[in-house]
């Protein structure tokens, strides 16, 4: 059973992940560049279901394309290079979802823009955090 300390750790990690995702979204929304149009054409895969920490597998698998799409920006809108930012997110995701069980992600039929994708995972973080508090 999860202890109060492990729950607190999970909550802090989720809050960190939430902030990172919000930072990326803000960076995109404040971004004025010819490459933005190109960035918005990329279609990301969305989870069929995202209600538990194990479903973060679906986010993990899309982190590489997310990094490559963010790389197009070559902007100062992000405090970190996309590579470092995504690396940080990856570490948090791996810790949150755990590596003991191998969960096969199921994707929804509809794909999403980078904005819709980020909003979906921001909502996921907020939802899980609310159940922990």
């Amino acid at each position: 059973a999860p202890t109060s300390s492990s729950t607190k750790k999970t909550q802090l990690q989720l809050e960190h992940l939430l902030l990172d995702l919000q930072m990326i979204l803000n960076g995109i929304n404040n971004y004025k560049n010819p490459k933005l149009t190109r960035m918005l054409t990329f279609k990301f895969y969305m989870p069929k279901k995202a209600t538990e920490l194990k479903h973060l597998q679906c986010l993990e698998e899309e982190l590489k394309p997310l990094e490559e799409v963010l790389n197009l920006a070559q902007s100062k809108n992000f405090h970190l290079r996309p590579r470092d930012l995504i690396s940080n997110i990856n570490v948090i995701v791996l810790e949150l979802k755990g590596s003991e069980t191998t969960f096969m992600c199921e994707y929804a039929d509809e794909t999403a823009t980078i904005v819709e994708f980020l909003n979906r995972w921001i909502t996921f973080c907020q939802s899980i955090i609310s159940t922990l508090t």
Epitope: R38, T41, F42, E61, K64, P65, E68, Y107
Partner: antibody
Framework: QVQLVQSGAEVKKPGASVKVSCKAS????????INWVRQATGQGLEWMGW????????GYVQKFQGRVTMTRNTSISTAYMELSSLRSEDTAVYYC???????????WGQGTLVTVSS | DIQMTQSPSSLSASVGDRVTITCRAS??????LGWYQQKPGKAPKRLIY???SLQSGVPSRFSGSGSGTEFTLTISSLQPEDFATYYC?????????FGQGTKVEIK
């Protein structure tokens, strides 16, 4: 980590067929197209076509149309490229590489040497 | 089909040199172009995608520029491990086509 592992070298006689496999790991196989590129010894790269592992849809370069077939087995995350009516000019290293929209050919297999000789 | 013409087909350079390779498309391909490096006996490796975005893990001495029909790959300061053959690839429309390659050799 993402890996594309291809089958071993093949020696075939003219007129025969060859089937090269490409096993994907480290990502969701159905999320990326598989492309096939070949390279004759000392020559440049030649794109042969693509296959969508999710739908099975394919697109082939006209010069290979009727001779090439790209298929997949999603249960084992493996793509195949079969080339028939082989001739000596088909002697080359055949590579598989994945792509997704405009993120193209980011990971490659190690290559499979196909030698066509009588 | 879109033709991709690379120049030069080969060049000799020394370590530390600035090297520029050009790729010209037979029609407008916007920025749907990638650059690949290949060493003997190895699979190609992507360096640049969408004309100017550096592949993660690729040294910053590599850069890409251009759009439309004229594209450039620049190596700002050639290193011993950069001696290889470089290819451009257009992927705006099928069939995708590669340039004929540029072999970078040691002077």
């Amino acid at each position: 980590q993402v890996q594309l592992v291809q089958s071993g070298a093949e020696v075939k006689k003219p007129g025969a067929s060859v089937k090269v496999s490409c096993k994907a790991s480290g990502y969701t196989f159905t999320n990326y197209d598989i492309n096939w590129v070949r390279q004759a010894t000392g020559q440049g790269l030649e794109w042969m076509g693509w296959m969508n592992p999710n739908s099975g849809n394919t697109g082939y370069v006209q010069k290979f149309q009727g001779r090439v077939t790209m298929t997949r087995n999603t249960s084992i995350s493996t793509a195949y490229m079969e080339l028939s009516s082989l001739r000596s000019e088909d002697t080359a290293v055949y590579y598989c590489a994945r792509s997704r929209q405009w993120l193209v050919l980011d990971y490659w297999g190690q290559g499979t040497l196909v030698t066509v000789s009588s | 089909d879109i033709q991709m013409t690379q120049s030069p087909s080969s060049l000799s350079a020394s370590v530390g040199d600035r090297v520029t390779i050009t790729c010209r498309a037979s029609q407008d391909i916007r920025d749907d172009l990638g650059w690949y490096q290949q060493k003997p006996g190895k699979a190609p490796k992507r360096l640049i995608y969408v004309a100017s975005s550096l592949q993660s893990g690729v040294p910053s001495r590599f850069s890409g520029s251009g759009s439309g029909t004229e594209f450039t790959l620049t190596i700002s300061s050639l290193q011993p491990e950069d001696f290889a053959t470089y290819y451009c690839l257009q992927h705006i429309s099928y069939p995708w086509t590669f340039g004929q390659g540029t072999k970078v050799e040691i002077k």
